[in-house]
């Protein structure tokens, strides 16, 4: 889980070691702050859980792409 050391900076210290189904992901944000030990992506799931993931992993990149496309698609 992400850890807010000194708000408003949130850092990830561990990454999930399992793929999370892309259909369970609602949004993401990138963590690039120099105050954090590593770059990360924090996914928020459809039930509002926050999960730290490694931006170098392909499934993480695919998931971000999927969410980006979803955001661009107008709702009918």
């Amino acid at each position: 889980q992400p850890d807010a050391i000194n708000a408003p900076v949130t850092c990830c210290y561990n990454f999930t070691n399992r793929k999370i189904s892309v259909q369970r992901l609602a949004s993401y944000r990138r963590i690039t702050s120099s105050k954090c030990p590593k770059e990360a992506v924090i996914f928020k799931t459809i039930v509002a859980k926050e999960i730290c993931a490694d931006p170098k992993q392909k499934w993480v990149q695919d998931s971000m792409d999927h969410l980006d496309k979803q955001t661009q698609t107008p709702k009918t």
Epitope: R18, K19, S21, Q23, A26, I46, Q70, K75
Partner: antibody, heavy 119, light 113 residues
Framework: QVQLVQSGAEVKKPGASVKVSCKVS????????IHWVRQAPGKGLEWMGG????????IYAQKFQGRVTMTEDTSTDTVYMELSSLRSEDTAVYYC????????????WGQGTLVTVSS | DIVMTQSPGSLAVSLGERATINCKSS????????????LTWYQQKPGQPPKLLIY???IRESGVPDRFSGSGSGSNFTLTITSLQAEDVAIYYC?????????FGQGTKVEIK
């Protein structure tokens, strides 16, 4: 194509434990979340628990908490479900089921394992 | 926990006639951001594991005949078999996969009248 192959039928006495296996093939094991669903004779489907990557751990239905343990052996791509303190009401077919990265629902099921609890 | 309630419990329909099964969730299983309902329908025949028919409430699984259709949104869902065939005799279950614990309806048995 994911394939789930389960161990054979078991007959157990009340109070004993049973361990059912589910071998996964056709997919990278660690990319799947395996769940267990049971069905008592003439009854409906009941979710027992499974690995939840959102929590990073195995979660169990409250009804089975403390009596069920689900483990995995990544060297053999096999998942196990152990149910202890068996009673006659645990007589059921036990299924393993999984979803892949692009789904989220159970699109693959094992063939089922009948566990009979009888004295 | 989200409770799934199916109706009716059983249904007898003449060959070629329409069968309609309802499923109600105790809370909405629609995620508005992606406009998806986290609901599936399964068909189960004796001695077999459940077979996926419909996912996202209305999308037919590959290979499922087009006489099967799913509809509904939010908390109310329907599975329709437009022209019942002998091979459709089975028990049908809805299931939500919005939040754990994943829960099933109690099942609807479809028979030939």
């Amino acid at each position: 194509q994911v394939q789930l192959v389960q161990s054979g039928a078991e007959v157990k006495k009340p109070g004993a434990s049973v361990k059912v296996s589910c071998k996964v093939s056709g997919h990278i094991f660690t990319e799947l979340s395996i769940h267990w669903v049971r069905q008592a004779p003439g009854k409906g489907l009941e979710w027992m628990g499974g690995f939840d990557p959102e929590d990073g751990e195995t979660i169990y239905a409250q009804k089975f908490q403390g009596r069920v343990t689900m483990t995995e052996d990544t060297s053999t791509d096999t998942v196990y479900m152990e149910l202890s303190s068996l009673r006659s009401e645990d007589t059921a077919v036990y299924y393993c089921a999984t979803n892949d990265f692009w789904s989220g629902y159970f699109d693959y099921w094992g063939q089922g394992t009948l566990v009979t609890v009888s004295s | 926990d989200i409770v799934m309630t199916q109706s009716p419990g059983s249904l007898a329909v003449s060959l070629g006639e329409r069968a309609t099964i309802n499923c109600k969730s105790s809370q909405s299983i629609l995620f508005r951001s992606n406009n998806k309902n986290y609901l599936t329908w399964y068909q189960q025949k004796p001695g077999q594991p459940p077979k996926l028919l419909i996912y996202w409430a209305s999308i037919r699984e590959s290979g499922v005949p087009d006489r099967f259709s799913g509809s509904g949104s939010g908390s109310n869902f329907t599975l329709t078999i437009t022209s019942l065939q002998a091979e459709d005799v089975a028990i049908y279950y809805c299931q939500q996969y919005y939040s754990s614990p994943w829960t099933f309806g109690q099942g609807t048995k479809v028979e030939i009248k």
